[in-house]
Interface confidence: low
């Protein structure tokens, strides 16, 4: 099941704006109507693991399906990070990453994807319906969250599959620019569409609007964008609580952590030239499952020159599920 | 470009080691995993191990205990040793990385390892 | 560990041809299968990943699809240069595991 935030409201554009090139009018409908097929938003989904050799292990992964470079991710408990949670580790692809007690490791596994494992008993161990959350921070995208918790039948040692969570959240003053022009496209063409099929010789004028072709498609809803932000976040039952966490992870991180507030993943970062990108930058794009992946090493077109894809700090777990968190 | 090539002894007796040595360009060690798949003649090909950009390593449990794979950085190398060869490891020994997290992304041509007195 | 099956060892199909090869995992994999090319000459690329993915400089002509244990991987119009073998591998539990190839020939 796909899961997607709901296009933000527009205020339909004036009537008129038809355009008023007799026949070629349908050209620009059929432009947006490209457009809109391509477009869309971008999804997080959180798996959530009981590990069977320890039952009071788990494993968290989080993952984001979009088309822009990461600047951060937190992975939080007990709710969303901004409202209640409490941050058990925040993943930057260049400066590092930091951990709290009860995570033990936290790793990337993939350029768009981390895993966390959560071990620990007493007032700080995770239980079966706790509620995890991860947040990731995108350029050009934005923030967008998700939250999963294990499901209450699940066997030990199983999990499931890693589909996008049913709580999906994002700021929307990072949906903007390609985002923005595709979406502001998409109302136009349905109301154009709506006029055309109530008016079948409409009355021409001018034309006041040029909507620019997208550097770079973003990712189009496979259904009409909606439940998403409708979907309250999940109950979480407070006997399951952490306590604050606020012992750092004997592996702290480097100095830049310090100033670093649990919320810095509320607002994109513009990334940093990251290094060692492994594969030329030939801004080819592979049209799949509804968008578009920046595939091994291709730059995205709206990252600008000095934004390079970035490496794992820690080396990609490539594509391997939940396997080989150790 | 990402290029990976795979240099090994060709032949190796019962009972003794093997190394071969991956040597990559195109992109750091430290920020990607390498992993070790072989293919005996005419059959399929088996995961060995896999070494991760901090270094860690993942084995394959069914050999394991005869399994080493270390990196060097600085080199652009990854080893892969192998101890007690029989010769049913006889076969074509790859590396392959996972560049920008996709499994196996990229392949070496492979190094052909003959087990044999 | 778990066991990938591909059924149909050899397949001979003609230029042009639609050629589906299937794999089948002995347990949910997640979609974490990913399909690879294997030439004569020894030569493997990696063509699908993560069920429906195609990687970087792969023909459109190929697809993959399926959910759960079982998957399958479609080459819409066969080509001289698709000559080859063909292997999935589930990337969802270690060890990582491969199926037994399907080798496809010419009519």
């Known amino acids: 099941m796909r899961t997607e935030a709901q296009v933000p409201a527009l205020q339909p554009p004036e009537p008129g704006l038809e355009g008023a090139m007799g026949h070629r009018t349908l050209v620009l409908p059929w432009v947006l109507l490209t457009l809109c097929v391509t477009a869309g938003t971008p999804e997080v989904w959180v798996q959530v693991r009981m590990e069977a050799t320890e039952l009071s292990s788990f494993t968290i992964r989080c993952g984001f399906l979009g088309s822009g470079s990461i600047s951060l991710v937190t992975v939080s408990w007990g709710g969303p990070n901004g409202a209640g949670g409490t941050t058990l580790a925040v993943l930057h692809p260049e400066r590092g990453i930091r951990q709290w007690a009860p995570a033990r490791q936290a790793r990337w596994e993939t350029q768009s994807s981390i895993s966390l494992i959560l071990e620990g008993s007493g007032a700080s161990s995770p239980c079966a319906n706790t509620t995890f959350c991860c947040k990731f921070a995108s350029f050009p995208e934005g923030s967008w969250e998700a939250c999963g918790s294990l499901p209450p039948s699940s066997d030990p040692g199983l999990s499931a599959p890693p589909t996008p969570a049913p709580i999906l959240r994002a700021d929307l003053a990072g949906i903007l620019g390609v985002s923005g022009v595709l979406l502001f496209g998409c109302v136009y063409l349905l109301h154009l569409l709506r006029r055309h099929k109530h008016r079948p010789a409409p009355r021409l004028q001018p034309s006041r609007t040029s909507p620019q072709a997208p550097r770079a498609r973003a990712w189009a809803p496979s259904q009409a964008s909606q439940a998403a932000l409708h979907v309250p976040y999940a109950t979480i039952n407070t006997s399951c609580r952490p306590a604050t966490l606020d012992t750092a992870h004997p592996h702290g991180g480097p100095s830049w952590w310090a100033s670093l507030p649990t919320h810095a993943a509320h607002r994109p970062q513009g990334p940093a030239a990251w290094a060692s990108t492994p594969i030329p930058a030939r801004g080819s794009f592979v049209s799949v499952e509804n968008g578009l992946y920046a595939q091994a090493g291709e730059r995205p077109p709206h990252t600008g020159p000095g934004l390079t894809l970035f490496p794992d700090p820690r080396g990609p777990r490539a594509m391997e599920g939940p396997l080989g968190v150790r | 470009q990402v290029q990976l090539k795979e240099s090994g002894p060709g032949l190796v007796a019962p009972s003794q080691s093997l190394s071969i040595t991956c040597t990559v360009s195109?992109?750091?060690?430290?920020?990607?995993?390498i992993k070790w798949v072989r293919q005996p003649p005419g059959k399929g090909l088996e995961w060995l191990g896999t070494?991760?950009?901090?270094?860690?390593?993942d084995y394959n449990s069914a050999l394991k205990s005869r399994l080493s794979i270390s990196k060097d950085n600085s080199k652009s190398q990854v080893f892969l040793k192998m101890t007690s060869l029989q010769t049913d490891d006889t076969a074509r020994y790859y590396c392959?990385?996972?560049?920008?997290?996709?499994?196996?992304?990229?392949w070496g041509q492979g190094t052909l390892v003959t087990v044999s007195a | 560990d778990i066991q990938m099956t591909q059924t149909t060892s050899s397949l001979s199909a003609s230029l042009g041809d639609r050629v589906t090869i299937s794999c089948r995992a002995s347990q949910d994999i997640s979609n974490y299968l990913n399909w690879y090319q294997q030439k004569p000459d020894g030569t493997v690329k990696l063509l699908i990943y993560?069920?429906?993915r195609l990687h970087s400089g792969v023909p459109s002509r190929f697809s993959g699809s399926g959910s759960g244990t079982d998957y399958s991987l479609t080459i819409s119009n066969l080509e001289q240069e698709d000559i080859a073998t063909y292997f999935c591998q589930q990337g969802n539990t270690l060890p990582l595991t491969f199926g037994a190839g399907t080798k496809l020939e010419l009519k």
């Open positions: 070494i991760w950009g901090d270094g860690s390593t």
């Open positions: 195109g992109f750091s060690l430290s920020g990607y995993g």
């Open positions: 993560y069920t429906s």
């Open positions: 392959a990385s996972d560049s920008l997290g996709i499994t196996f992304g990229y």
